[in-house]
């Protein structure tokens, strides 16, 4: 596949399950992968009766859904887990739900956080 045009080296990191997994809760993540693999950022969340629960953010490895996407946009209609991915450093800071079948676009703005670098 090869590395993409908008090369991803770092992503926003977040883990709602950080205590159980013994990781940081939030910060920055450096992406790693073999030379022939494209690297992406992702965000995943749940929508419980209109309340957004952020689940994870971080790096994602070589996925055609993410190729050449500058913004993190989830397109599935009504999934159990919302997921978007994109290419470019920190492109997962903001994330959006825009179902392919049409409907309102909803963009989620991140709360300001002090960055912590994860490797």
């Amino acid at each position: 596949s090869g590395r993409g045009e908008a090369e991803t080296r770092e992503c926003i990191y977040y883990n709602a399950n950080w205590e159980l997994e013994r990781t940081n809760q939030s910060g920055l993540e450096r992406c790693e992968g073999e030379q022939d693999k494209r690297l992406h950022c992702y965000a995943s969340w749940r929508n419980s009766s209109g309340t957004i629960e952020l689940v994870k953010k971080g790096c994602w490895l070589d996925d055609f859904n993410c190729y050449d996407r500058q913004e993190c946009v989830a397109t599935e209609e009504n999934p159990q887990v919302y997921f978007c991915c994109c290419e470019g450093n920190f492109c997962n800071e903001r994330f959006t739900h825009l179902p392919e079948a049409g409907g309102p676009e909803v963009t989620y703005e991140p709360p300001p956080t002090a960055p912590t670098l994860l490797t």
């Epitope: 997994e21 994602w60 996925d63 055609f64 859904n65 190729y67 887990v81």
Partner: antibody, heavy 120, light 107 residues
């Protein structure tokens, strides 16, 4: 409903090329999902061989990459596997499967599997 | 490659028993794990994806939990049709890898 059907020779000679096809019915292969090949040697576990998407992007298991080619034929709604220079270690049940839009959705539809024996 | 280790490799249980199977990843995979059931001579069947999401049509006695490196598949009350081999599979890394399987046998 979605159905996958593997086809190809059940016996392949060592050093030859194994060729299998997976015919997809009830679903367009051009939809934005992953199409997978997985194999299972007799009495053993599952091994991912590789994946392809409608655009032709392929993803291969590095342990087999030098010998594997996966291709898609959207006009026939099918995808294929070629594995070259086979040995007895390639004897297995070969499955084709559909995964979701993303890898993490899991492989929700499988073919029934076809047994391939490598022997002279 | 991420190694997936399942335990136990086999378990004997009776109808109505609660059965728990564990899967450990050699490095963190967040919640991106699937579970499959396979019966002899048949293709695997997807039970759970994203660690805890039940695939459509799968009975609610199956449940999944865990994140990071440690995951669990639980069958709350074992039914006769549940005797099979179960596999976990990680999704975020390439190559995709499976656990070695856990065979649930009749006691």
């Amino acid at each position: 409903q979605v159905q996958l059907q593997e086809s190809g020779p059940g016996l392949v000679k060592p050093s030859e090329t194994l060729s299998l096809t997976c015919a997809v019915s009830g679903y367009s292969i051009s939809s934005g999902v992953y199409w997978m090949w997985i194999r299972q040697p007799p009495g053993k576990g599952l091994e991912w061989i590789g994946s392809i998407v409608h655009s032709g992007h392929t993803y291969y298991n590095p342990s087999l990459k030098s010998r594997v080619t996966i291709s898609v034929d959207t006009s026939k709604n099918q995808f294929s596997l070629k594995l070259s220079s086979v040995t007895a270690a390639d004897t297995a049940v070969y499955y084709c499967a559909r995964a979701g839009k993303y890898r993490w959705h899991g492989m929700d539809v499988w073919g029934q599997g076809t047994t391939v024996t490598v022997s002279s | 490659d991420i190694q997936m280790t399942q335990s136990p490799s086999s378990v004997s249980a009776s109808v109505g028993d609660r059965v728990t199977i564990t899967c450990r990843a050699s490095q963190g995979i967040s919640s991106w794990l699937a579970w499959y059931q396979q019966k002899p001579g048949k293709a695997p069947k997807l039970l759970i994806y994203a660690a805890s999401n039940l695939q459509s049509g799968v009975p609610s006695r199956f449940s999944g939990s865990g994140s990071g490196t440690d995951f669990t598949l639980t069958i709350s009350s074992l039914q006769p049709e549940d005797f099979a081999t179960y596999y976990c599979q990680q999704a975020p890394d390439l190559p995709i890898t499976f656990g070695g399987g856990t065979k649930v046998e009749i006691k």
